[in-house]
Amino acid sequence: EPPTACREKQYLINSQCCSLCQPGQKLVSDCTEFTETECLPCSESEFLDTWNRETRCHQHKYCDPNLGLQVQQKGTSETDTICTCEEGLHCTSESCESCVPHRSCLPGFGVKQIATGVSDTICEPCPVGFFSNVSSAFEKCRPWTSCETKDLVVQQAGTNKTDVVCGPQDRQR
């Protein structure tokens, strides 16, 4: 009796089970009662990453430098090329088809996590006792100056955007 279902890594065609082509190879011809499935390796610029019956291999992704992309990992016959963004840029999506500049953290915010080629800068508000007076993609919130350790007193309180202003202690005569 002809099969109605096939084993893993097989497919049903013309009432018989044929072997799928292994990753890195494409289908040339289906199996017959006399021959196995005929497969051919993908060319240098192509890949197939699963057991398959595809008659065409997929083109490797192109990391377009005009979009700020660069190759992170060269593709093989079994894997696609992985793109990442040039320095100062990060991917706009998981598939990394284009890049945008990293955002800077505004004054009053510091960098919690520096951006990578695939993720943007993560900012956090400066908590009490810390400040940031610059717009930066690298700088964390800095602690207020400790006037006491300098034998000075606070003349002007700090904010999340400004440091405290220290001054000499008043000498009572």
Partner: antibody
């Protein structure tokens, strides 16, 4: 018991035609692909033709394409090989074989074809 | 066409000894290879399919190995009934092709 019995061989002149038959028994003939394989005096084996179980698909090597026709009559459990424009190099023992698991799992005893002037 | 080259052409052996027969393909055929045995005045019979899978009714002293382009048929402790010609056959692609055979004879 699987049995394949070839017949129809003989001595013919170059350019002549011949039709070989293979009577199959001991299995469901219509469920199996069948092939013809020949063996020359040097004992070399050469695939000649194959036909799918239903008879819809036929396969030939280039050196016999157009000169050989494989066919089957499932109702009669019989396989055929019609050969025309015979050449001296077609001289061989012709075997009928059954295709099981993509192998030639059963062979007949062969029928001899001699092409000579 | 895929060419199968068998070596040696002839192999002389003493019963009880073990032998290895080689079959080399002109390009990769994965494991799509069968082995056949033909005794004197008999038809060929299937010994091994898919390069290494044993066939029901065939003595366990026969085993096959290999993949890609290099294949081996091993006969452990040859018996007198094993003398004859051994053929490999590829079924990776059309046309189906056979090796030239290795004749196993008594030393």
């Amino acid at each position: 018991e699987v049995k394949l019995v070839e017949s129809g061989g003989g001595l013919v002149k170059p350019g002549a035609s011949l039709k070989l038959s293979c009577a199959a028994s001991g299995f469901t003939f219509s469920n199996y692909g069948m092939s013809w394989v020949r063996q020359n005096s040097d004992k070399r084996l050469e695939w000649v033709a194959s036909i799918s179980s239903g008879g819809d698909d036929t396969y030939y090597p280039d050196n016999v394409k157009g000169r050989c026709t494989i066919s089957r009559e499932n109702a009669k459990n019989t396989l055929y090989l019609e050969m025309s424009s015979l050449k001296t190099e077609d001289t061989a023992l012709y075997y009928c074989t059954r295709a099981g698991g993509k192998a030639m799992d059963y062979w007949g005893q062969g029928t001899s074809v001699t092409v000579s002037t | 066409d895929i060419v199968l080259t068998q070596s040696p052409a002839t192999l002389s052996v003493i019963p009880g000894n073990s032998v290895s027969l080689s079959c080399r393909a002109s390009q990769s055929i994965r494991d799509n290879l069968h082995w056949y045995q033909q005794k004197s005045h008999e038809s060929p019979r299937l010994l091994i399919n898919y390069a290494s899978q044993s066939i029901s009714g065939i003595p366990s002293r026969f085993s096959g190995s290999g993949s890609g382009t290099d294949f081996t048929l091993t006969i452990n402790s040859v018996e007198t009934e094993d003398f004859g010609i051994y053929f490999c056959q590829q079924f990776n692609s059309w046309p189906l092709t056979f090796g030239g055979g290795t004749k196993l004879e008594l030393k």
